[in-house]
C-alpha cells in the first residue's frame, strides 16, 4: 500500500516552489492538462548556455514524512537532447541531481539551507532514458522519462526535495512523493494494524477480531516488509469465541443464528440446537432446555436434553417366607438417556393396621437403589405384616426435576408365621430295618402345630428319588424298611395354620446290624 | 517580427453575432496558448477565454459561458472568437494575448501574458 | 473565486518610490503577474512570477508577494511611468485567469 505525502498531478493551485538563484534562465512553473483535461504544474528550465559552476536549484515546500522512515519519490520528466538544441554549449547536460534536507520544521528560506551538497543530502545523479528531439519549427518528440528513487533513512518530522540543475533543458512533469506501508490485513481471524516498516522486516503483533479469542501458543505476529507487503508466514490466528462461527473467508466471527450454537471456541460452525432444546437469541454458546428437559452437571454443553424416565411397568412379587423377589420391565419412557437405575421405597403396615417406613431389619439384595437390573430380593420380611414397595426409575436428570417422581406400587402381605425349625430329634428305638424317633413340640407363634413332615435319606445316596418323607401328627415318627447297618440321615420339620416351617437340622442315625440285639433305646 | 493583430471588431445590435480574429507572427503559433481578454470603456481588464496549443481544450469566464466560442487554426497561425447573444456588457475593447510560451512542450504554459495585440473594439448597442 | 483588489489610484513624486498592492486570501500562495497600460495601448508584462522582469523592462520596476499581499514597486519613479498597472493570477477553474481591478499610477 502506498501512502501519499505529496502527488503534483493533484495540486490544482500554483506550486510555487522555491529557486535559486534569482537568475535568468531559472527554473519556472508552467501549467498544462492531464489526459482528463485538468489542470497540473510542471516545472522546466532550459538554460544550456549557462556560466560555467553555475547551478540551478528547485526546491519543494516542506514535506511532513508522516512516520515513513524511507520515502519514494517517482519523478516524470522529459529531457530535451541537447544536439537538438542549436545555441546549446559545452555546458549542456541531460542528467540533473536530486537532493533531499531534513528538518523538524518548515524553516527553510530562500537562502538557506546552504544550496549545496551538505547540508543537502544527494539521493541520485539522474540521467535520461529517453531523450526528447526537437527541429526548428516542429512538435518536440519523445518519450517521458519515469524514475523512483528511495530517500532515507528519515527521523525528522519532514524534508524538502530539491533538483540541481547544471546545464540540462528539460521539464520535471511530476513529482510523486510516498511511502510503502502493509494495509490493515486481516486473517485468520486476527486483525494486524496497517503497519508504516521502520526496517528491513518488522514483527506486527496482531489482535482477534470482534467476537474472536486467542488460540493456544504464541501471540500471533506477522512481519510487514520494507516494500510495503506482508511476509507470507503461518499465523497462529485466534479463533471464534462460543457462540460465534468464522465468515467472510475467516475474517471475521458471525454470531451463531438464532436455533443454533456453538459450545466451544475454534474452528467449527454453528450447530442446530439438540433434540429437547432452542436457542432464542443470536451467538448462543449453548441451547437452553425446553421445559420440563433438563441437562445433567457431567452433560457435554452440546449434547440433548432429557427428561426423567416414566414409571417401572408391571412389577411381579414372589413371596417365599420371609423373603420376596420382586422383578418389573423397563418403563415406557427412557426420558432419552442411557443411564437408568432403580429405586425401592418400602412402607409396612403391622397386623392392627398402623403404618411406617421400613425398618432397618429388611435387606435388598443387590440393594434398595442405583439397581441396574429390573428385579430385588428383599429379605427378613415379618410375617402377617403387609408391605408396600414404590418401584421408580431414575437417570441423571431426574434429580434436577421438580414435582412427584413416577412410581409402580406393589402390595404383599406375608403369611402369620410358620413353626420354628425343629431339632433335638432323638431315636427311642433301632432295629436292623427301623428306627423310632422322637422331638420336642416346638413353640409355634400362630397357633398350634398341626402335623409334622419327616425327611429322610440313607447316607450316601444324595439323589432325589433316594429322598423320603413321612407324615405324622405325633411328635414321633417310626421309619421302617431301612438296610441294616445303614447311616441315615433325618430332617423333620412342622406345620401350623401358618405353613411349614423350615426343616431342623440334620440328624444322624444307623440301624442295628443283628435282630438278635433287640431294640434298643439310642439318644442322638 | 513578433506581433498579434485583433480584427473584426465593429457595431452590433444586442442579440447579435460577431467573429473576431487574431493573426500571430513571428513565433510558432501552434506551440502557443493563447487568451482572450477585454476591456470595458475606462474599466479594467477582464479575461475572457483561453485555448491550448492543440486547440482541443478550452476555458471559458462564467460571463461568457454558453454564448462565446475560442478556436484556433494552427495553419492559419490564426485564433478566434465567436460571440453570440451579444449584450450591451459585452462593448470592449478585446485583446488577443500569448500565455508564457514553453521551451519545448506546448503541452504545457505559463500563467502570464506576455504578448498582447493591440485590441479590436465591439460596441453592442441599438 | 480569488478576487483581486487593487487600491484604484496612487500617487508619486518623480524619483521616488511607488508602490502598488494587490491583495487577496492567501495570495503568497500563487504567482502574482503585473501589467502596465497606458492610454490607448495594450497592457506590457511588467512583473512574472512575484518578482521577475522580463527583459526589455527597467530594473526599477520590481515585486514580491507574501501574506494576502504582493506588491509592485518602482524606485526612482519617472514621469514615463504613469500608467495603469494590473496585476493577475490564476482564478480557481481550470486556466482561468483573474485580474485586479487596476491602480492608476500618477506622477506629480
Known amino acids: 500500500l502506498e501512502e501519499t505525502l505529496l502527488n503534483t498531478k493533484l495540486e490544482t493551485a500554483d506550486l510555487k516552489w522555491v529557486t535559486f538563484p534569482q537568475v535568468d534562465g531559472q527554473w519556472e512553473e508552467l501549467s498544462g492538462l492531464d489526459e482528463e483535461q485538468h489542470s497540473v504544474r510542471t516545472y522546466e528550465v532550459c538554460d544550456v548556455q549557462r556560466a560555467p559552476g553555475q547551478a540551478h536549484w528547485l526546491r519543494t515546500g516542506w514535506v511532513p514524512r508522516r512516520g515513513a522512515v524511507h520515502v519514494y519519490a517517482t519523478l516524470r520528466f522529459t529531457m530535451l537532447e541537447c544536439l537538438s538544441l542549436p545555441r546549446a554549449g559545452r555546458s549542456c547536460k541531460e542528467t540533473f541531481t536530486v537532493f533531499y534536507y531534513e528538518s523538524d520544521a518548515d524553516t527553510a528560506t530562500a537562502l538557506t539551507p546552504a544550496w549545496m551538497e551538505n547540508p543537502y543530502i544527494k539521493v541520485d545523479t539522474v540521467a535520461a532514458e529517453h531523450l526528447t528531439r526537437k527541429r526548428p519549427g516542429a512538435e518536440a518528440t519523445g518519450k517521458v522519462n519515469v524514475k523512483t528513487l528511495r530517500l532515507g533513512p528519515l527521523s525528522k518530522a519532514g524534508f524538502y526535495l530539491a533538483f540541481q540543475d547544471q546545464g540540462a533543458c528539460m521539464a520535471l512533469l511530476s513529482l510523486h512523493l510516498f511511502y510503502k506501508k502493509c494495509a490493515q490485513l486481516t486473517v485468520n481471524l486476527t486483525r494486524f494494524p496497517e503497519t508504516v516498516p521502520r526496517e528491513l522486516v518488522v514483527p506486527v503483533a496482531g489482535s482477534c477480531v470482534v467476537d474472536a479469542v486467542p488460540a493456544p501458543g504464541p501471540s500471533p505476529s506477522l512481519y510487514c516488509r520494507e516494500d510495503g507487503q506482508w511476509a507470507e508466514q503461518p499465523v497462529t490466528g485466534c479463533s471464534c469465541a462460543p457462540g460465534f462461527e468464522a465468515a467472510e473467508g475467516n475474517t471475521k466471527c458471525r454470531a451463531c443464528a438464532q436455533g443454533t450454537f456453538k459450545p466451544l471456541s475454534g474452528e467449527g460452525s454453528c450447530q442446530p440446537c439438540p433434540a429437547n432444546s432452542h436457542s432464542n437469541t443470536i451467538g448462543s454458546a449453548v441451547c437452553q432446555c425446553r421445559v420440563g428437559y433438563f441437562r445433567a452437571r457431567t452433560d457435554p454443553r452440546g449434547a440433548p436434553c432429557t427428561t426423567p424416565p416414566s414409571a417401572p411397568r408391571s412389577v411381579v412379587s414372589r413371596l417365599n417366607g420371609s423373603s420376596l423377589h420382586l422383578e418389573w420391565s423397563a418403563p415406557l419412557e427412557s426420558g432419552g438417556r442411557e443411564d437408568l437405575t432403580y429405586a425401592l421405597r418400602c412402607r409396612e403396615c403391622r397386623p392392627g393396621g398402623s403404618c411406617a417406613p421400613c425398618g432397618g431389619d429388611l435387606t435388598f439384595d443387590p440393594g434398595p437403589r442405583d439397581l441396574v437390573e429390573p428385579w430385588v430380593v428383599v429379605r427378613g420380611l415379618r410375617p402377617d405384616f403387609t408391605y408396600t414397595f414404590e418401584v421408580t426409575a431414575l437417570n441423571g436428570v431426574s434429580s434436577l426435576a421438580t414435582g412427584p417422581v413416577p412410581f409402580e406400587p406393589v402390595n404383599v402381605t406375608t403369611d402369620r408365621e410358620v413353626p420354628p425349625a425343629v431339632s433335638d430329634i432323638r431315636v427311642t428305638r433301632s432295629s436292623p430295618s427301623s428306627l423310632s424317633l422322637a422331638w420336642a413340640v416346638p413353640r409355634a407363634p400362630s397357633g398350634a402345630v398341626l402335623d409334622y413332615e419327616v425327611k429322610y435319606h440313607e447316607k450316601g445316596a444324595e439323589g432325589p428319588s433316594s429322598v423320603r418323607f413321612l407324615k405324622t401328627s405325633e411328635n414321633r415318627a417310626e421309619l421302617r424298611g431301612l438296610k441294616r447297618g445303614a447311616s441315615y440321615l433325618v430332617q423333620v420339620r412342622a406345620r401350623s395354620e401358618a405353613g411349614y416351617g423350615p426343616f431342623g437340622q440334620e440328624h444322624h442315625s444307623q440301624t442295628q446290624l443283628d435282630e438278635s440285639e433287640g431294640w434298643r433305646e439310642q439318644l442322638a | 517580427q513578433v506581433q498579434l493583430v485583433e480584427s473584426g471588431g465593429g457595431l452590433v445590435q444586442p442579440g447579435g453575432s460577431l467573429r473576431l480574429s487574431c493573426a500571430a507572427s513571428g513565433f510558432t503559433f501552434n506551440n502557443a496558448w493563447m487568451s482572450w481578454v477585454r476591456q470595458a470603456p475606462g474599466k479594467g481588464l477582464e479575461w475572457v477565454s483561453a485555448?491550448?496549443?492543440?486547440?482541443?481544450?478550452?476555458s471559458y469566464a462564467d460571463s461568457v459561458k454558453g454564448r462565446f466560442t475560442i478556436s484556433r487554426d494552427n495553419s492559419k497561425n490564426t485564433l478566434y472568437l465567436q460571440m453570440n447573444s451579444l449584450r450591451a456588457e459585452d462593448t470592449a475593447v478585446y485583446y488577443c494575448?500569448?500565455?508564457?510560451?514553453?521551451?519545448?512542450?506546448?503541452?504545457?504554459?505559463?500563467?502570464?501574458?506576455?504578448?498582447w495585440g493591440q485590441g479590436t473594439l465591439v460596441t453592442v448597442s441599438s | 473565486d480569488i478576487e483581486l483588489t487593487q487600491p484604484p489610484s496612487v500617487s508619486v513624486a518623480p524619483g521616488q518610490t511607488a508602490r502598488i498592492s494587490c491583495s487577496g486570501d492567501?495570495?503568497?500562495?500563487?504567482?502574482v503577474h503585473w501589467y502596465q497600460q497606458k492610454p490607448g495601448q495594450a497592457p506590457v508584462l511588467v512583473i512574472y512570477y512575484d518578482s521577475k522582469r522580463p527583459s526589455g523592462i527597467p530594473e526599477r520596476f520590481s515585486g514580491s508577494n507574501s501574506g494576502n499581499t504582493a506588491t509592485l514597486t518602482i524606485s526612482g519613479t519617472q514621469a514615463e511611468d504613469e500608467a495603469d498597472y494590473y496585476c493577475?493570477?490564476?482564478?480557481?477553474?481550470?486556466?482561468?485567469?483573474?485580474f485586479g481591478g487596476g491602480t492608476k499610477l500618477t506622477v506629480l
Open positions: 493577475q493570477a490564476w482564478g480557481a477553474g481550470s486556466h482561468q485567469m483573474v
Open positions: 492567501n495570495l503568497g500562495k500563487k504567482y
Open positions: 485555448i491550448n496549443a492543440k486547440g482541443q481544450f478550452t
Open positions: 494575448a500569448r500565455k508564457g510560451m514553453s521551451f519545448y512542450n506546448n503541452k504545457y504554459a505559463k500563467s502570464m501574458f506576455d504578448l
